[in-house]
Interface confidence: low
């Protein structure tokens, strides 16, 4: 079955620049299928823009200005690229790639869409680092005791643009866990968002990951925030350093993200 | 030019109660096109639900039913037993792929219908309230309550900032909520919740006994290594403070 991935969840440009949006096709040979590009402007219907067929023929929707959009495909990387020249305010939209895919049953064909790339146009000069800054919250002991479950919370702050995707996984598992999240909120010139995951007691001793996709993540890769396993057994600690912490004080574990 | 017009911009549905979305075609006979339905969820994911010819996307056949009313020139999508997963924007779209002769394989979309899901009417349930802290950040977690109306107060004399609460449907069909704030005195912050003319405090849920059970953060792997931790021998960590952990990037 064909699958489409649009690695950029957003693409931020200043006026008159060129935007290149990528769509990676898997499960089907790109040179044996047609790739379609659609756009959804805010408050408007989703509209077909342009397609490139298996034999390289390009078809543009009537009314689309010539020279504005360029579509291409690179069989070696199984990628189709939509290039938007001279970006202007009216190009602000979410752009989707799509293809017709045959189902297992005969004669059954559906059009599948990629997850979309939001084109953002800004005139702001932003700080050098507008990637999401994480803070983690571990379950309260009261919750683990009373409800035999624990909630992890992943807070992400000071990011731009507002487009962000968060999901959770257990370590060594690719299964996406059912989580909940708040709306993305504006704070001055940047945004914040949080997501939380409630797990049963039996999963509390597993490491969990809050995985964050954002345009400005370092090196363009998903950021993984590790939530350590938590145990409900007695801990005895050997002397490590000469510490003056009182036993009644909090145990503060400082995590440093050395990759940032 | 043809136009697909949804019957409603927003449709509120209750969990488990069947709902029907309608989309009429203007300017052409609907029988000349194939109708498709898609759902767009948070994060813009466009998922195929149904296409004429009895084609359903994976996982949709049991809970959705697509139909065409030729006489009324409209397409119908029934959600047989809505769940919180069905929240999103639903789009009808048409194509003429496979109709012989000159065909178009592009989709023409209508505007979306926003489907909001709310729990089924049920007995009132009092929430559980828990506080989670990290540095100046405090989160108040409010779990499993019904109905939705709620006021969450993070009690502090030294507020830096507070955010609007997130209220979502829980997997069990009630509500969960989280309110976040930043406070200079985060250690002393508590959470009080007004719900159903009653007040519930996070302190009501604190474990009162001096237990030696506690949550032990384990050293993490990958690139996120804890800095050298300083432990007192045989340290007993107070259970209500175990979730305090800061992460600096």
């Amino acid at each position: 079955a064909g699958h489409l991935e649009q690695p950029q969840i957003s693409s931020t440009k200043t006026l008159s620049k060129t935007a290149r949006l990528e769509c990676v096709v898997s499960g089907i040979t790109i040179s044996a299928t047609s790739v379609y590009w659609y756009r959804e402007r805010p408050g408007e219907v989703i509209q077909f823009l342009v397609s490139i067929s298996y034999d390289g023929t390009v078809r543009k929707e009537s009314g689309i200005p010539s020279g504005k959009f360029e579509v291409d495909r690179i069989p070696e990387t199984s990628t189709s690229t939509l290039t938007i020249h001279n970006v202007e305010k009216q190009d602000i939209a979410t752009y989707y790639c799509a293809l017709w895919e045959a189902q297992q049953e005969l004669g059954k064909k559906i059009k599948v869409f990629g997850p979309g790339t939001k084109l953002i146009i800004t005139d702001k000069q932003l700080d050098a680092d507008v990637s999401p800054k994480p803070t983690i919250f571990l379950p309260s002991i009261a919750e683990t005791k009373l409800q035999k479950a624990g909630t992890y919370l992943c807070l992400l702050e000071k990011f731009f643009p507002d487009v962000i995707k968060i999901h959770w996984q257990e370590k060594k598992s690719n299964t996406i866990l059912g989580s909940q999240e708040g709306n993305t909120m504006k704070t001055n010139d940047t945004y914040m968002k949080f997501s939380w995951l409630t797990v049963p007691e039996k999963s509390l001793d597993k490491e969990h990951r809050c995985i964050v996709r954002h345009e400005n993540n370092k090196n363009g890769v998903d950021q993984e925030i590790i939530f350590p396993p938590i145990k409900t057994d007695v801990i005895t600690m050997d002397p490590k350093d000469n510490c003056s912490k009182d036993a009644n004080d909090t145990l503060l574990l400082q995590l440093t993200n050395t990759s940032a | 030019a043809i136009e697909l017009v949804p019957e409603h911009q927003t449709v509120p549905v209750s969990i488990g109660v069947p709902a029907t979305l309608r989309c009429s075609m203007k300017g052409e006979a609907i029988g000349n096109y194939y109708i498709n339905w898609y759902r767009k969820t948070q994060g813009n994911t466009m998922t195929f639900i149904y296409r004429e010819k009895d084609i359903y996307g994976p996982g949709f056949k049991d809970n959705f039913q697509g139909d065409i009313d030729i006489a009324k020139n409209l397409a119908v999508l029934k959600i047989l037993a809505p769940s919180e997963r069905d929240e999103g924007s639903y789009y009808c779209a048409c194509d003429t792929l496979g109709m012989g002769g000159e065909y178009t394989d592009k989709l023409i979309f209508g505007k979306g219908t926003r489907v909001t899901v709310e729990p089924r009417s049920q007995p009132h349930t009092k929430p559980s309230v828990f506080v989670m802290k990290n540095g100046t950040n405090v989160a108040c977690l409010v779990k499993e309550f019904y109905p939705k109306d709620i006021r969450i107060n993070l009690v502090s004399s030294k507020k830096i900032t507070e955010f609007d609460p997130a209220i979502v449907i829980s997997p069990s069909g009630k509500y969960n909520a989280v309110k976040l704030g930043k406070y200079e005195d985060s250690n002393s912050v508590t959470c009080s919740v007004q719900h159903d003319n009653k007040t519930v405090h996070s302190t009501d849920f604190e474990v009162k006994t001096d237990s030696t059970d506690h949550v032990k953060p384990k050293e993490t792997e990958n690139t996120k290594q804890p800095s050298k931790s300083c432990h007192k021998p045989k340290a007993i960590v107070h259970t209500e403070k175990v979730n305090m952990m800061s992460l600096t990037v």
Epitope: E101, L106, G107, K109 | L97, G98, M99, G100, G101, Y103
Partner: antibody, heavy 122, light 111 residues
Framework: EVQLVQSGGGLVKPGGSLRLSCAAS????????MNWVRQAPGKGLEGVSS????????YYADSVKGRFTISRDNAKNSLYLQMNSLRAEDTAVYYC???????????????WGRGTLVTVSS | QSVLTQPPSVSAAPGQKVTISCSGS????????VSWYQQLPGTAPKLLIY???KRPSGIPDRFSGSKSGTSATLGITGLQTGDEADYYC????????????FGGGTKLTVL
């Protein structure tokens, strides 16, 4: 002009072989599933074989399974039917027919060739 | 013997209306789409109706199709002498790993 031009019919002895060809023009052949349909003298239509656009799916009527082979060459815009071990009951007019423009098929034939007569007789 | 059952013949006077039935089972008509073909004497079949009720461009609206359960019907109104032909229904049968299946055909005579 959109059309299907057939060739290759004729008289053949029982047990013999014959290859039918169908040349497509005026449309993008590689987008369409293709079919062979036959009609015995004075009888109705019988689906013989179907092939999807990329040859991923191939189907035969039970009466010809193991004896007939359908194939296509998208570069040459051509459809073929190789008929081996022919029997008297295979005598019919053979039509090639175009299906809907999908990866598989839409269960209807919107373009037909004129047909070619295959006679199996000793 | 055909998988789909049609009456061998029907007849009506010019200007009249006629219907031709096509009966099958849940594995063919019941779960798939039906097409109808017209075959004038000495010619190849021609598509009249597809997907139960859709008409290709160029086919007059005198021809209509419908489906209910495991049966399909072709309707012809305002009969003309040029409509005298054999009519076939066709569909897919999901229980047979076979090609498309047809009805035995119905000879329409315009009196």
């Amino acid at each position: 002009e959109v059309q299907l031009v057939q060739s290759g019919g004729g008289l053949v002895k029982p047990g013999g072989s014959l290859r039918l060809s169908c040349a497509a023009s005026g449309f993008t052949f590689s987008r369409y599933s293709m079919n062979w349909v036959r009609q015995a003298p004075g009888k109705g239509l019988e689906g013989v074989s179907s092939i999807s656009s990329s040859s991923s799916y191939i189907y035969y009527a039970d009466s010809v399974k193991g004896r007939f082979t359908i194939s296509r060459d998208n570069a040459k815009n051509s459809l073929y039917l190789q008929m081996n071990s022919l029997r008297a009951e295979d005598t019919a007019v053979y039509y090639c027919a175009r299906d809907g423009p999908t990866v598989n098929w839409d269960y209807y034939f919107d373009l037909w060739g004129r047909g070619t007569l295959v006679t199996v007789s000793s | 013997q055909s998988v789909l059952t049609q009456p061998p013949s029907v007849s009506a006077a010019p200007g009249q209306k006629v219907t031709i039935s096509c009966s099958g089972s849940s594995s063919n008509i019941g779960n798939n789409y039906v097409s109808w073909y017209q075959q004038l004497p000495g010619t190849a079949p021609k598509l009249l109706i597809y997907d139960n009720n859709k008409r290709p461009s160029g086919i007059p609206d005198r021809f209509s199709g419908s489906k209910s359960g495991t049966s399909a019907t072709l309707g012809i109104t305002g009969l003309q002498t040029g409509d005298e032909a054999d009519y076939y229904c066709g569909t897919w049968d999901s229980s047979l790993s076979t090609s498309v299946v047809f009805g035995g055909g119905t000879k329409l005579t315009v009196l």
